[in-house]
């Protein structure tokens, strides 16, 4: 026999937001495998810059996302399933890893704001990659993606170390509408943006964290009254 | 070795057309940016235009844009400059350079061809 | 009239040291692009000589070499050789015109 009333009701809403959260979870990973497994990109790791060093933090970043993306499809299956299937196994293990996850982001919040300037620097170093990317074979449609992204969501374009082929491509082809690379190369420069984002708007990534924090204790709340509720109605 | 061999210069006169061709031998053309840069007879360097290696990104000097087209046939391995509404100041001598990312500047070039723009 | 200024000629007897001057702008040099310099030996084409201000491609001589400050390069050649009488550009990138600039050359002559 099923749950009922209003345990029915968390039942399905815990199936929608992990089939939410399985959905961008699936979402994050394509787009991490495409940007790791492209021609393009993966014929980047043998090409020779000549004294340019050879990227490096791009694919660590890569990897980061096909881990995030993984783990975010494993979790919201869990949920999404064991909710659906009235499993108390599955919505233990849900509330398990919920748990494990909710850890490392109290881990990783303390150690971003401890290393939050190298944190930045990394992000400048994945910008600057990407953007070498984009300009050395003008075919990476994914690393083009990524630098659009950073110029779109920072509204920024190129930074003060471009080389003179960077700055002729930016100013031809990557910057936003808008933005003048010519007189305000420096005013609009990238890496002042990460680093001010990293500094003046870490509040903003704090409220993120924290939004992230509550949705979590809230799936947890929610997987324990389900299991619950399952538990009860399989004794009557 | 390297080797950048420019053709196709001659005399032409103003308003005429021009199509000048640089093949490349002993590296990957496919793979690098190309350019071409200019000499006036008893003066210095000009830079003309650039190219990206799948013909994406292109530039033009102002002096230039608007009349001069540069293209690419990387299985070819041959680089183009179609020059049309030449003016007595395009009279030169054409140099394909290619274009190093890595060295950021034109680190091998051509022997070049002359262009005489004269009626 | 260049955007990089350069002396039109420069001389020196064999085993001397001379420098070549490149004096550019904010927006070119000053902006923190690199500053590259070219042999053009009668007759021929452009070789690059250094690169990123202070390097040597493989090939050519400790003899030459490189220094920038500020919005300034420099071309130093020691021991002066009759084979080193050339024309000698700089050549950097101009964010305002957005084009590679070259200085206007200066013409090397070794004396006797």
């Known amino acids: 026999m099923g749950v009922e009333g209003c345990t029915k009701c968390i039942k399905y809403l815990l199936f929608v937001f992990n089939f939410v959260f399985w959905l961008a979870g699936g979402v994050i990973l394509g787009v991490a495998l495409w940007l790791r497994h492209d021609p393009q990109t993966t014929n980047l790791l043998y090409l020779e810059l000549g004294d340019k060093p050879a990227p490096n933090t791009f694919y660590v970043g890569i990897y980061i996302l096909i881990a995030v993306g993984a783990v975010m499809m494993f979790v919201g299956f869990l949920g999404c399933y064991g909710a659906i299937q009235e499993s108390q196994c599955l919505l233990g293990t849900f509330f398990t890893c919920l748990v494990i996850l909710f850890a490392c982001e109290v881990a990783a919040g303390i150690w971003g704001f401890v290393n939050k300037d190298q944190i930045a620097k990394d992000v400048k170093q994945f910008y600057d990659q990407a953007l070498q990317q984009a300009v050395v074979d003008d075919d990476a449609n994914n690393a083009k993606a990524v630098v659009k992204t950073f110029h779109e969501t920072l509204d920024c374009c190129g930074s003060s170390t471009l080389t003179a082929l960077t700055t002729s491509v930016l100013k031809n082809n990557a910057c936003p509408s808008g933005s003048n690379i010519i007189s305000n190369l420096f005013k609009e420069d990238c890496h002042q943006k990460i680093d001010d984002l990293f500094s003046g708007k870490l509040y903003l990534i704090g409220i993120a964290a924290i939004v992230v924090a509550v949705i979590m204790i809230f799936e947890m709340i929610l997987s324990m009254v389900l299991c619950c509720g399952i538990r009860n109605s399989s004794v009557y | 070795e390297v080797q950048l061999l420019e053709s196709g210069g001659g005399l032409v006169q103003p308003g005429g057309s021009l199509r000048l061709s640089c093949a490349a031998s002993?590296?990957?053309?496919?793979?690098?940016?190309m350019s071409w840069v200019r000499q006036a007879p008893g003066k210095g360097l000009e830079w003309v235009s650039y190219?990206?290696?799948?013909?994406?990104?292109?530039d033009y000097a102002d002096s230039v844009k608007g009349r001069f087209t540069i293209s690419r046939d990387n299985s070819k391995n041959t680089l183009y400059l179609q020059m049309n509404s030449l003016r007595a100041e395009d009279t030169a001598v054409y140099y394909c350079a290619r274009y190093s990312y890595g060295r950021d500047n034109f680190d091998y070039w051509g022997q070049g061809t002359l262009v005489t723009v004269s009626s | 009239q260049s955007v990089l200024t350069q002396p039109p000629s420069a001389s020196g007897t064999p085993g001397q040291r001379v420098t070549i001057s490149c004096t550019g702008s904010t927006s070119n040099i000053g902006a923190g692009y690199d500053t590259h310099w070219y042999q053009q030996l009668p007759g021929t084409a452009p070789k690059l000589l250094i690169y990123g201000n202070s390097n040597r491609p493989s090939g050519v001589p400790d003899r030459f070499s490189g220094s920038k400050s500020g919005t300034s390069a420099s071309l130093a050649i020691s021991g002066l050789r009759s084979e080193d009488e050339a024309d000698y550009y700089c050549q950097s990138y101009d964010t305002n015109l957005s084009v590679w600039v070259f200085g206007g050359g200066t013409k090397l002559t070794v004396l006797g």
């Open positions: 002993g590296f990957t053309f496919s793979s690098n940016y």
């Open positions: 190219i990206s290696s799948s013909s994406t990104y292109t």
